[in-house]
């Protein structure tokens, strides 16, 4: 099942970095080639093309976004998951987080909410009416929060759930990691990096490295020759 | 420090229940998912079961689907395996296990026995 | 499903260098480039020791790295030591749904 939704990737830098985060020095260059993601949001897309962005929680997704199964009815079947475009005005839902903000989930259609000026956090949080759910969790879904409200009081350490890298202590940048978005540790020197070169060949990201560290560029392995090209073994390197 | 104590496990006959716990402290426990990892005795390591941050997301290994539940309580810093309809084949050491980078903090593991 | 293969046994002498290997299918080791090593003493808890292929988490003796080719991950363990004869485990995962797979396991005795 893994073939067609893994592939490996850098996360790549805020562009620009955020200050006080993992993501290098303010204002130092960044190279980006055509197609290679960037982090826009809280979601990864191609500068010239949106790639569905993988999820596990409806928090992970943006605030106009909501986390299920690409396919309908494919969901609680171990479908990959991703973030899709909330519900507009009197679309069908089976949950608030479906619905756009200044809405929430009445009797399965997206009614206007009286409280559209509170965060969407805080109107969930205050209406409890469970109309199923259509993750693969099976449980009733819990009103959806911000994480930064909730988490991101301090730094993230390595393995902490995050949003972008400024949520990471110093080091860490903010990349997919199978079940979420963590904080990782920025690439030293020797360690293996991905290097993206054919434009969509990103798929769904469900494991990213993050970038190499200052001074350093992810290049191929000097003595790592093998036979087929995609398989050459990228490092970080001295510039 | 990062620690992770186990209890709830002991001797159940099958077809029983048992309640795990595992108490979490040294570190910001509602920032990780986390999971269940059982070895039976002299068996090697099985992945039992994994829970996101905010306990809404949750999967489990073919063999415990419908009979165990796993969930946490983030304000008592605690996670939770519910195991309903034990089976000899279920006697194992239980760990919990903290999913940061991998697999990458666990408990000292719990005994559960089922036999008649 | 996807499998990990561990050999069930290997051994050296202290000094000497060892390597387990861990074969998998295309879609788990090979496929995505991702695995992980847990050293586990007997009668205590696993330790991660490797992830990523071959990233040391702070606090783990250089002496251990690992590395991949093909469908093959390989943990070696260099300047062999007594407190190094243990279990290890190679791990990867499956994303859907989400699942730990580990490899059978792997004796490492220090001989003499």
């Known amino acids: 099942t893994l073939n067609s939704v893994l592939i490996n990737s850098n996360a790549i830098k805020n562009l620009p970095p955020p200050l006080g985060g993992a993501g290098g020095q303010p204002g130092s260059a960044v190279s980006v080639a055509p197609g290679v993601l960037y982090e826009g949001g809280n979601k990864y897309q191609t500068l010239d093309n949106y790639q569905p962005y993988p999820c596990a929680e409806d928090e992970e997704c943006g605030t106009d976004e909501y986390c299920s199964s690409p396919s309908r009815g494919a969901a609680g079947v171990g479908g990959v998951q991703i973030c899709l475009a909330c519900r507009k005005r009197r679309k069908r839902c089976m949950r608030h987080a479906m619905c756009c903000p200044g809405n929430y989930c009445k009797n399965g259609i997206c009614m206007p909410s009286d409280h559209s000026h509170l965060p969407r956090g805080e109107i969930e949080e205050g209406i409890i009416e469970n109309l199923g759910n259509d993750h693969g969790a099976g449980d009733g879904y819990p009103r959806r929060t911000t994480l930064t409200s909730k988490i991101y009081h301090t730094k993230g350490q390595e393995g902490s759930v995050c949003l972008r890298s400024s949520d990471c202590a110093t080091g860490l940048c903010c990349a997919r990691h199978f079940w979420s978005k963590i904080c990782k540790p920025v690439l030293k020197e020797g360690q293996v990096c991905t290097k993206h070169r054919r434009k969509g060949s990103h798929g769904l990201e469900i494991f990213q490295r993050c970038y190499c560290g200052e001074g350093l560029a992810c290049r191929i392995q000097k003595d790592h020759h093998q036979t087929s090209n995609s398989s050459r073994l990228h490092t970080c390197q001295r510039h | 420090q990062v620690q992770l104590v186990e209890s709830g496990g002991g001797l159940v006959q099958p077809g029983g229940s048992l309640r795990l716990s595992c108490a979490a402290s040294?570190?910001?426990?509602?920032?990780?998912?986390m999971s269940w990892v059982r070895q039976a005795p002299g068996k090697g390591l099985e992945w039992v079961s994994g829970?996101?941050?905010?306990?809404?997301?949750?999967h489990y290994a073919d063999s415990v689907k419908g009979r165990f539940t796993i969930s946490r309580d983030n304000s008592k810093n605690t996670l939770y395996l519910q195991m309903n309809s034990l089976r000899a084949e279920d006697t194992a050491v239980y760990y919990c296990?903290?999913?940061?980078?991998?697999?990458?903090?666990w408990g000292q593991g719990t005994l559960v026995t089922v036999s008649s | 499903d996807i499998a990990l293969t561990q050999p069930a046994s290997v051994s050296g002498s202290p000094g000497q260098s060892i390597t387990i290997s861990c074969t998998g299918t295309?879609?788990?080791?090979?496929?995505?480039?991702?695995v992980s090593w847990y050293q586990q003493h007997p009668g205590k808890a696993p330790k991660l020791m490797i992830h990523?292929?071959?990233n040391r988490p702070s606090g783990v003796s250089n002496r251990f790295s690992g590395s991949k080719s093909g469908n093959t991950a390989s943990l070696t363990i260099s300047g062999l030591q007594a407190e190094d004869e243990a279990d290890y485990y190679c791990?990867?995962?499956?994303?859907?749904?989400?699942?730990?797979?580990f490899g059978g396991g792997t004796k490492l005795t220090v001989l003499g």
């Open positions: 990523d292929g071959s």
């Open positions: 296990a903290r999913m940061g980078i991998d697999l990458d903090y």
């Open positions: 829970i996101s941050y905010s306990g809404s997301n949750t």
């Open positions: 791990q990867s995962w499956d994303v859907s749904p989400i699942t730990a797979v």
């Open positions: 295309s879609s788990d080791v090979g496929g995505f480039n991702y």
């Open positions: 040294g570190f910001t426990f509602s920032s990780y998912w």
